[in-house]
């Protein structure tokens, strides 16, 4: 697993505790919650990284303040369970036995009900479409400059193969991102599209899950991109199974 | 290698003001917090605050409040202490520490000495 | 404000001596409690975080142990180069040190 070596960290998740125990004193990095060794070479799953966040010191709740215009936070958070591979399992339950299904994403994709409720798999996530808003301009953003500098950052930021972007829309003050990832498109060793979205966001809020580096500084041919809305939805490869009396409410 | 190197040693008058200064090197400035310790003679270890050179967000120790202001220059990658309002009880060793992603103070500058005496 | 109580003060041991200091919290911090060690004239340096976890370069004569609210820093044979004073820091909420523990030579 890659980690700086020289002072044992983690680049790619600061919710780790690294040590020079690995085999040969190689440095090894397990992540904050569940303890489970992260291959610091590449983006970590969400799900660790919820399991983390549930677990991490107060201090980095109250001391990383989300910027003046961060989103509204309201990412459903929870102490999830994943299995041996860093994946969300299926069935989600809280400790007052209440189980909800979710998708690859983290995402509730039933109704609740209680340990009796059956998950048979986990769904894939295969499309995610995340819309920004930014802060006024003196003019609009040149749509191919925007569309350049955006598809660069998930190739560089987050090692996202320029393949699952699928494409970028704009109309000011909107943008809208498109992720695609099929279960028969990912190869192993692909970032998913889930993390990339989800490290995304936090940077987004100013709440980056980098080690060592400064918050995301968005430019379009040197003219701050600052973003004050975001909005995300994902799009199961199977509909989501929610009773009519939800969706009429 | 990371360096945190800060300013030279400072005699002060009582009710005067000082700024002590504390230059990184050697990693990025702004992926890291940077704080502010105190060590008076023969006392304990003080933690004075924090910053967020990245935001420029501060955050202090209640018992420092409004004696102790910390900046930041992201240029030249310096965070900056000014204590005002110097009594013989500021007189210690002030040190500058990086806080590492999960916050424990990983790299620490040599210390400054402030005496303050009339 | 999270409290932490350190102890010995000092003490007083044997080159090849098994030292022993103790942190108490008031209030539970997890296991985000890190120790350093302090020569007189020079900055602190980083020997364990996280409770256990030794910093890169650090001897593993070093160790660290608990959770909560109770930690223990250990020498397991004390060195001519050890002498020095201990601290003990809680990284969860906020920032406080123990008030140190300074070890001598016998």
């Known amino acids: 697993h890659t980690a700086a070596q020289d002072n044992c960290t983690c680049p790619t998740n600061k919710m780790t505790v690294c040590s020079p125990d690995g085999p040969g004193g190689r440095c090894q990095c397990r992540a904050l919650g569940s303890g489970m060794a992260v291959d610091c070479s590449t983006l970590t799953s969400k799900c660790l990284l919820l399991k983390a966040r549930m677990s991490a010191p107060k201090n980095a709740r109250t001391l990383v303040r989300p910027s003046e215009h961060a989103l509204v936070d309201n990412d459903g958070l929870y102490d999830p369970d994943c299995d041996p591979e860093g994946r969300f399992k299926a069935r989600q339950c809280n400790q007052t036995s209440v189980c909800w299904c979710v998708n690859s994403v983290g995402v509730r994709r039933t109704d609740k009900g209680d340990l009796s409720l059956r998950c048979d798999e986990l769904v894939r996530t295969h499309h995610i479409l995340i819309d920004l808003r930014h802060r006024p301009t003196a003019g609009a953003f040149n749509h191919s400059d925007l569309d350049a500098e955006l598809r660069r950052l998930f190739r560089e930021r987050y090692r996202l193969h320029p393949k699952f972007v699928a494409a970028v829309h704009y109309e000011q003050p909107t943008i809208q991102i498109e992720l695609r990832q099929n279960t028969s498109q990912k190869a192993a060793g692909d970032v998913d599209i889930g993390d990339a979205a989800y490290y995304f966001e936090r940077d987004i809020k100013g709440e980056s899950l980098f080690q060592g580096r400064g918050g995301l500084d968005l430019r379009v041919r040197g003219e701050p991109l600052q973003v004050e809305r975001t909005l995300i939805y994902y799009l199961d490869e199977i509909p989501p199974k929610f009773s009519m009396k939800r969706l009429t409410a | 290698q990371v360096q945190l190197v800060q300013s030279g040693a400072e005699v002060k008058k009582p009710g005067a003001s000082v700024k002590v200064s504390c230059k990184a090197s050697?990693?990025?400035?702004?992926?890291?917090?940077m704080n502010w310790v105190k060590q008076a003679p023969g006392q304990c270890l003080e933690w004075i605050g924090i910053i967020n050179p990245y935001q420029g967000d501060t955050t202090y120790n209640q018992k420092f409040q409004g004696k102790v202001t910390i900046t930041v220059d992201k240029s030249t990658s310096t965070v900056y202490m000014e204590l005002s309002s110097l009594r013989s009880e500021d007189t210690a060793v002030y040190y500058c520490?990086?806080?590492?992603?999960?916050?424990?103070?990983?790299?620490w500058g040599q210390g400054t000495t402030v005496t303050v005496s009339s | 404000d999270i409290q932490m109580t350190q102890s010995p003060s000092s003490l007083s041991a044997s080159v090849g001596d098994r030292v022993t200091i103790t942190c108490q919290a008031s209030?539970?911090?997890?296991?985000?409690l890190a120790w350093y060690q302090k020569k007189p004239g020079k900055a602190p340096k980083l020997l364990i975080h996280?409770?256990?976890n030794l910093q890169t370069g650090v001897p593993s004569r070093f160790s660290g142990s608990g959770s909560g609210t109770d930690f223990t820093f250990t020498i397991s044979s004390l060195q001519p180069e050890d002498i020095a004073t201990y601290y003990c820091l809680q990284y969860d909420d906020l920032f406080t040190f123990g008030c140190g523990t300074k070890l001598e030579i016998k």
């Open positions: 209030q539970d911090i997890n296991k985000y």
């Open positions: 520490a990086r806080g590492a992603g999960l916050y424990y103070f990983d790299y």
């Open positions: 050697g990693s990025s400035f702004t992926g890291y917090t």
């Open positions: 996280y409770t256990s």
